[in-house]
Interface confidence: low
């Protein structure tokens, strides 16, 4: 009796049917950017406030006929998806609809930045509490609707977008491709990515995550009682706005960044069929699908952690690939992958102030990525500590020297274009956990970082004989920082992390040989908070139960919630 | 039609002043860019938003504006101040001929331009 | 006026399904949400869930969830619960109650008269 | 799920009492976007089904003698009758409508 999309991101070992929270998302306000709506639809009415505010191109055609239900349609069933009284996520959400999409579904982008700046305006004049706006839009890239939303987001507002229903690049279309937005790819009730006619979901690094988005029952403009199901990466992006609803009313003070983070921890991982995606965008795209947190308890005290790509860099022999992590994130490491194999390594540097991760092409290689870890650690102050090429046939070392600085990731970059194999492997001498090591050719960079209670661990996963992928996870309780491949050598590929584990990806076993050159091991650096544990543990203590605690932890309501940017 | 041959010779009086003495050189240093849709069905052309350097007041987004619409006057183009940004980013939101483009991206204070273009519903 | 007009007594033997149903009359059938609660004799009283005409969704209580299946028919304005493998301690008055759909009215303003169901072997 | 609890399980009075009913939940029952108590009061006379006579904590259902009246909020509530009267001798029930729906477990006002 519950709809499957309702099920699929309550958390599990709940039912959705076993909680009807009367005011999730209570004290969050969700602006809708689409059509016009029916506001006394019988789902939606007396939670949604038609503004005045409609900015829209003609209808196309000469003999097109304005038809109410049909030009009410698209945003009255996204409304419900969002906060709907029986088919809503965040039933308790009150919503503010904007018209920015004709009865053709059809708008522009300055009809779009304008509608952006009247809620900017609106916020200003009427400070409320917490701000999502829902964009079930998409069009080409453009810099200036994405310079919008990062200007919104820096404002405070959480933007939640659709991904797109081309079955190509999200990157390619605003205002997915922003990084300040949340990005959202449709699955269905399979876990596959939708198909929609020969086209579906978008995919790629600039979403963040999927979410239903394949036959989802709402409401339908056609009667105020009346249900319809649609599909697409608008449905998708209802429900993680209504998720982003519900962890907001129960933590109000929760950033951008803190909310994706908690976005990308309480998703579903690896259960999307990655077959799907073309073979070249498959490792790009997050393998996560939207849930609700189980509780509070535990989230708090986490070290929280996502992996961001980069744009590729081009096949042009100095080129570089950039990556680089929100405002308030820490970027703990940073590693490179190249699908030729053909790549100059990886490095962090300062750029405005803050650390990015730029990877290096080699000569004749097809172009890199640069990966970094970005992760959530309150009052840190991360360095990296370099070590040029080594003289000695030893390899090159760096620890991190300073008192109370743990390392959290490992970098290496070399100048020449083939670093030759190293052989035998260099393995850390034990009881040196604070140090990188690497070719004795390569510069060798270390993330060292202090914060409040940090305590940080390698773990190491080699394999004598090629393999082409090598794989190490941190266990529970644990955050994966930092991931990187030893030796290093001209046969590996890249690592990054994905989740909570470290990939280190060699080329085909064909192409090495049995040798020890196929000899591989992949490097873990995991982390963990005793401060922000027991910061979390003297909260829960000192308060009578507030926010997120009232509504999950006494309600019992395992409900919602979602994750964020890959840029 | 009517309405638009009003509104030009009102522009033509009401700025011809205004436009004297006004250096049309951009800021030293800096180009502007033009970007456009890169799908070509999904392009609007003939409307632009212009978007100012970030620390551009409300006041000079306007007298940016009125310059455009000064210097395309003279030239004898008619154009239209169709919405001035402010609060999330300055610049405004105008109608002309794409012939003004050059002349645009040197007018003071403009980072960039961009076409206006499609969005849909997903 | 407004009516919930429930069926007649029902003696049922244990494992065996009983279904109740509840007319509605003198309103908008779908513009209320159907409750069913029950009260054993001399006990008080037990919410099982609940039927949204207008969409079908239904809620049950996690004690009935697997045994309880609500439905409705709009064309005649009748609601229906089905509770299956019945077991002596079913033996109850079984209420329909409505409830106006709207979020800030959940409290059951009529109830039906109640039907009886007997489970004895 | 939230427990309601009734106090006093039974009581007598007689005919122009007052009489005070109270009922306790698990957990707070405001409501924070509506800023109401989801709590509602119901009489209940042998072989009736259930009446309505409070909700929202202290609204009085149409109807329903001013006699009676409601109070409280977050977790404590009582219902008040202010001058018995004959009619009123039954069994009251406070609901929670919080979280799904909950019943207390009744209070049986009988003749003294």
């Known amino acids: 009796s519950i709809p499957w999309n309702l099920e699929r991101i309550t958390p599990p070992r709940y039912r959705a049917d076993e909680y009807q929270p009367p005011d999730g998302g209570s004290l969050v306000e969700v602006y809708l950017l689409d059509t016009s709506i029916q506001s006394d639809h019988r789902e939606i009415e007396g939670r949604v406030m038609v503004t005045d505010f409609e900015n829209v191109p003609e209808e196309d055609g000469t003999r097109f006929h304005r038809q109410a239900s049909k030009c009410d349609s698209h945003g009255t069933h996204l409304a419900g998806v969002v906060s709907g009284r029986d088919a809503g996520v965040a039933k308790g959400a009150s919503m503010r609809s904007l018209r920015v999409l004709n009865c053709q579904g059809k708008g522009t982008v300055s009809g779009t930045l304008i509608g952006l700046e009247f809620i900017r305006k609106s916020q200003l004049v009427q400070p409320v509490g917490p701000l999502v706006v829902l964009l079930p839009l998409a069009g080409g890239y453009s810099r200036v609707l994405n310079a919008a939303c990062q200007r919104l987001a820096r404002a405070g507002v959480v933007l939640v977008t659709a991904a797109g229903n081309f079955r190509d690049d999200a990157c390619l279309y605003s205002p997915a491709s922003a990084p300040e937005v949340i990005t959202v790819g449709a699955t269905n009730a399979q876990d596959q990515p939708v198909t929609l006619g020969t086209l579906g979901t978008n995919f790629g690094r600039c979403v963040d995550l999927f979410a239903p988005g394949e036959d989802i029952i709402g409401a339908s403009s056609d009667c105020s009682t009346c249900f319809v199901s649609q599909s697409g990466t608008s449905q998708a992006a209802a429900h993680v706005a209504g998720i982003a609803a519900m962890m907001l009313s129960a933590e109000p003070e929760l950033t951008l960044a803190e909310l994706r983070q908690r976005l990308i921890h309480f998703s579903a991982k690896d259960v999307i069929n990655e077959a799907w995606f073309p073979e070249d965008q498959r490792v790009l795209t997050p393998n996560l699908v939207a849930a609700l947190p189980p509780s509070t308890h535990g989230a708090g005290w986490q070290l929280f952690c996502r992996t961001v790509w980069s744009a590729h860099s081009g096949p042009t022999r100095m080129a570089t690939a950039v990556a680089r992590c929100a405002p308030d994130e820490e970027l703990l490491s940073c590693s490179s992958f190249s699908r030729s194999g053909k790549r100059r390594g990886e490095r962090m540097e300062a750029q405005g102030g803050k650390l990015v991760c730029r990877a290096h092409n080699a000569f004749g290689g097809e172009g890199v990525y640069a990966i970094a870890r970005c992760c959530l650690l309150p009052q840190a102050n991360c360095s990296v500590h370099t070590a040029p090429p080594a003289e000695a046939s030893m390899g090159t070392r760096v620890h991190c020297h300073q008192q109370g600085h743990v390392l959290t990731g490992c970098s290496s970059h070399w100048e020449v274009e083939d670093l030759g194999t190293h052989k035998p492997p260099v393995l850390r001498p034990r009881g040196q956990p604070n140090q990188c090591v690497g070719h004795r050719e390569a510069s060798i960079h270390a993330s060292c970082c202090h914060a409040p209670g940090l305590e940080c661990k390698v773990k190491e996963h080699g394999i004598p004989a090629p393999q082409e992928q090598v794989t190490v996870a941190c266990e529970e309780g644990w955050t994966l920082t930092g991931c990187s491949a030893l030796p290093g050598t001209s046969h590996v590929l890249g690592a990054y992390a994905v989740d909570n584990t470290c990939v280190v990806r060699s080329r085909d076993v064909s192409t090495t040989g049995s040798t020890s050159e196929g000899a591989v091991t992949a490097v873990a650096i995991c982390c963990r908070s005793r401060h922000l544990a027991q910061a979390s543990q003297e909260l829960q203590g000192s308060t009578s139960g507030s926010g997120l605690n009232d509504i999950f932890e006494a309600q019992k309501i395992e409900w919602h919630e979602h994750h964020h940017h890959h840029h | 039609q009517e309405d638009e041959d009003g509104d030009y010779e009102e522009l033509v009086l009401a700025l011809r002043s205004e436009e004297d003495g006004l250096a049309e050189a951009p800021e030293h240093g800096t180009t502007a860019t033009f970007h456009r849709c890169a799908k070509d069905p999904w392009r609007l052309p003939g409307t632009y938003v212009v978007v100012l350097k970030e620390e551009t007041h409300l006041s000079q987004s306007e007298r940016t504006a009125r310059r455009l619409q000064a210097q395309a006057a003279r030239r004898g183009y008619l154009t239209k101040i169709l919405h001035v940004f402010h609060g999330l980013l300055p610049g405004f939101l105008v109608k002309m001929s794409g012939d003004l483009l050059e002349l645009a991206l040197k007018l003071p204070h403009v980072d960039y331009i961009e076409e206006d273009s499609s969005v849909f519903a997903q | 006026q407004v009516q919930l007009v429930q069926s007649g007594a029902e003696v049922k033997k244990p494992g065996a399904s009983v279904k109740v149903s509840c007319k509605a009359s003198?309103?908008?059938?779908?513009?209320?949400?159907m409750h069913w609660v029950r009260q054993a004799p001399g006990q008080g009283l037990e919410w099982m869930g609940y039927?949204?005409?207008?969409?079908?969704?239904?809620k049950y209580h996690q004690n009935f969830k697997d045994r309880v299946t609500m439905t409705r028919d709009t064309s005649i304005s009748t609601a229906y619960m089905e509770l299956s493998r019945l077991r002596s301690d079913d033996t109850a008055v079984y209420y329909c109650?409505?409830?106006?759909?709207?979020?800030?009215?959940?409290?059951?303003?009529?109830w039906g008269q109640g039907t009886t169901v007997t489970v004895s072997s | 799920d939230i427990q309601m609890s009734q106090s006093p399980s039974s009581l007598s009075a007689s005919v122009g009492d007052r009489v005070t009913i109270t009922c306790k939940s698990s957990q707070s029952l405001l409501n924070s976007r509506t800023r109401k108590n989801f709590l509602a009061w119901y009489q209940q006379k042998p072989g009736k089904a259930p009446k309505l006579l409070i909700y929202w904590a202290s609204t009085r259902e149409s109807g329903v003698p001013d006699r009676f009246s409601g109070s409280g909020s977050g977790t404590d509530f009582t219902l008040t009758i202010s001058s018995l009267q004959p009619e009123d001798f039954a069994t009251y029930y406070c609901?929670?409508?919080?979280?799904?729906?909950?019943f207390g477990q009744g209070t049986k006002l009988e003749i003294k």
């Open positions: 039927i949204n005409p207008s969409s079908g969704f239904t």
């Open positions: 609901k929670q409508s919080f979280n799904l729906f909950t």
């Open positions: 003198g309103y908008t059938f779908n513009d209320y949400w």
């Open positions: 109650a409505r409830q106006y759909d709207y979020d800030e009215d959940w409290y059951f303003d009529v």
